[in-house]
Interface confidence: medium
Amino acid sequence: SPVPPSTALKELIEELVNITQNQKAPLCNGSMVWSINLTAGVYCAALESLINVSGCSAIEKTQRMLNGFCPHKVSAGQFSSLRVRDTKIEVAQFVKDLLVHLKKLFREGQFN
């Protein structure tokens, strides 16, 4: 049966928590990703940014989970208008910012 949206969001949050807490060396070798506008379409925008990071096992589960939240197919090199123009940040900072934002969505009861 389908996972309830609240459970799926909790699981995504848990995964991001694990990433931030288990970080020893620089996450994804310090790879940089496009910063995104967190105010709308956050799941697809986050996936569009993170999907361009390859060979980083630490975020593979996050990529798969985000894919489950995003209603359309996302492929590498694809960018929506939600990207913050010409601003790149380290994956570690991206994950931390995304985690706080998703917790705020959870706090609002916004599970979709």
């Epitope: 969001l9 909790k10 949050i13 848990e14 928590v17 706080v100 917790k103 705020k104 959870f106 706090r107 609002e108 009861g109």
Partner: antibody, heavy 122, light 108 residues
């Protein structure tokens, strides 16, 4: 400097009413959610009520719902708490607290008043 | 309503590390804030959004949050850290702000 100053506390008999006020200064009052938090003597912190920045939404702790009313006047930078049908268990220091708002939930309490004491006793 | 559980007291020697826990069902999905309250004073925010420190709060104060437990850690504890500490979350189910019962930190 940013400041919250409570007033209106005192001794009141059970069943009577009291109105607390909080004067805000040094920040854009109308852009913040405002809360009341209380602390009974020797006890922990208890959240009482919140009112959103524009006054459109209020929420109350179960222990005060139907008896307390939180209001604000953004033109005067004031927060109020009307307390009716007071009980002995309402005896506490009442703090006026500022919290940034994120849509319809509250962020951390980043500015507190010094508190005003309310004693409910016959 | 959501329930946050803290140990009533924690004791630590000066210079050591104090760990104060805050338990709640899947608290790792919530943003947790921590407050310090000294006798006769209003509470002071020391950690917000699980891990962030307001300006003027020493780096000795840090937070973490995962699973069913959030933690406030105070390293190199000083006598001035002796106070009551409270955790807090916003519960979206009840639209209530919820405090833990508080932990009294004693510096031996």
């Amino acid at each position: 400097q940013m400041q919250l100053v409570e007033s209106g506390g005192g001794v009141v008999q059970p069943g009577r009413s009291l109105r607390l006020s909080c004067a805000a200064s040094g920040f854009a009052f109308r852009t913040y959610g405002m809360h009341w938090v209380r602390q009974a003597p020797g006890k922990g912190l208890e959240w009482v009520a919140v009112i959103w920045d524009d006054g459109s939404n209020t929420h109350y702790a179960d222990s005060v719902k139907g008896r307390f009313t939180i209001t604000r006047d953004n033109s005067k930078n004031t927060l109020n708490l009307q307390m009716n049908s007071l009980r002995a268990e309402d005896t506490a220091v009442y703090y006026c607290v500022r919290a940034p708002q994120w849509y319809l939930s509250a962020e951390a309490f980043d500015l507190w008043g010094q508190g005003t004491m309310v004693t409910v006793s016959s | 309503s959501y329930v946050l559980t803290q140990p009533p007291s924690v004791s630590v020697a000066p210079g050591e590390t104090a760990t104060i826990t805050c338990g709640g069902n899947m608290i790792g999905a919530y943003l947790v804030h921590w407050y310090q309250q000294k006798p006769g004073q209003a509470p002071l925010l020391v950690i917000y959004d699980d891990v962030d420190r307001p300006a003027r709060i020493p780096e000795r104060f840090s937070g973490s949050n995962s699973g069913n437990t959030a933690t406030l850690t105070i390293s190199r504890v000083e006598a001035g850290d002796e106070a009551d500490y409270y955790c807090q979350v916003w519960d979206h189910n009840s639209d209530h702000m919820v405090f833990g019962g508080g932990t009294k930190l004693t510096v031996l």
